[in-house]
Amino acid sequence: EEELQMIQPEKLLLVTVGKTATLHCTVTSLLPVGPVLWFRGVGPGRELIYNQKEGHFPRVTTVSDLTKRNNMDFSIRISSITPADVGTYYCVKFRKGSPENVEFKSGPGTEMALGAKPS
């Protein structure tokens, strides 16, 4: 049985203010059952960046079609980047729970930093 791996290939992502950033995350298994969420930072103070099930995230879109069957690509795009968006982003797999889902495994994280403005 294949053990779930969370793959975030970029350790560092240099972005430009006003542009769109793509944060990549793929998984190697559909199991265990449960959702993948995106956070910025770690610990109890981390910020939820995207949850497909609930919440309103107007600047975030998914790279893969939300209706794709057995999807293993959980990459997202964040539009209209501002300096406030810098930080380390983690895709996190949760194991389905009742009533609460339980964190199962996190990706290694991708640090988003501002690159030099093109001249």
Epitope: L31, P32, G34, P35, V36, Q52, K53, N71, F74, K96
Partner: antibody, heavy 119, light 108 residues
């Protein structure tokens, strides 16, 4: 994809039965699997789902039924203890399919096996 | 637990006619709804998922629509093999997965 249930039969209240579902035509270990039942002349009722190690049960069977899987044999099981008359139904094994990042529906079903609980 | 209510319970339709029936959820399930067909003596068969996407091999006369709490399955020009029971199922919030009580489509 083929799912073939077996193990149904007639038992008395309080007795036990173990259902099996032999799967073929897909990578069994990659997918969650589910049992759904249908009482005579009634609608469909979800019974239990198993992911990798994660298991989920309807309240009506919790503590009495145990779902398990043997990925080396491509087989799903349902151990049913303390059976009651209201457990009388056709039991279907179904393969889960995932969409929209975290939701499951059932894209392949077996033909079912009949369990009758009667004194 | 999310309750799904299907209506009507029985629909009498002549072959070649259009059949439309509904599934109402007790709370918002977004688009996380599937439709199944069950012919007499057979196992259920997946028709539609994500409220509107036809499963591979399902004829174009079957279509799903709706989101949130109100969903519709439409069969245009009913064929003899379409007379069956149709169930909706939500997978937005589980456990438990829940099914509607079914709509039986019978020959008028």
């Amino acid at each position: 994809v083929q799912l073939v249930e077996s193990g149904g039969g007639v038992v008395r209240p309080g007795e036990s039965l173990r259902l099996s579902c032999a799967a073929s035509g897909f990578r069994f270990s990659n997918f969650a699997m589910t049992w759904v039942r249908q009482a005579p002349g009634e609608g469909l009722e979800w019974v239990s789902t198993i992911g990798s190690g994660d298991t989920y049960y309807a309240d009506s069977v919790k503590g009495r039924f145990t779902i398990s899987r043997d990925n080396s044999k491509n087989t799903l099981y349902l151990q049913m203890n303390s059976l009651r008359a209201e457990d009388t139904a056709v039991y279907y094994c179904a393969k889960d399919s995932t969409v929209s990042w975290s939701g499951d529906f059932f894209d392949y079903w077996g033909l079912g096996t009949l369990v009758t609980v009667s004194s | 637990e999310i309750v799904l209510t299907q209506s009507p319970a029985t629909l009498s339709v002549s072959p070649g006619e259009r059949a439309t029936f509904s599934c109402r959820a007790s709370q918002n399930v977004k688009n996380d709804l599937a439709w199944y067909q069950q012919r007499p003596g057979q196992a259920p068969r997946l028709l539609i998922y994500a409220a509107r996407i036809r499963e591979t091999g399902i004829p174009e006369r079957f279509s799903g629509s709706g989101s949130g709490t109100e969903f519709t399955l439409t069969i245009t020009s009913l064929q003899s093999e379409d007379f069956a029971v149709y169930y909706c199922q939500q997978y937005y919030d589980w456990p438990p997965f829940t099914f509607g009580g079914g709509t039986k489509v019978e020959i008028k």
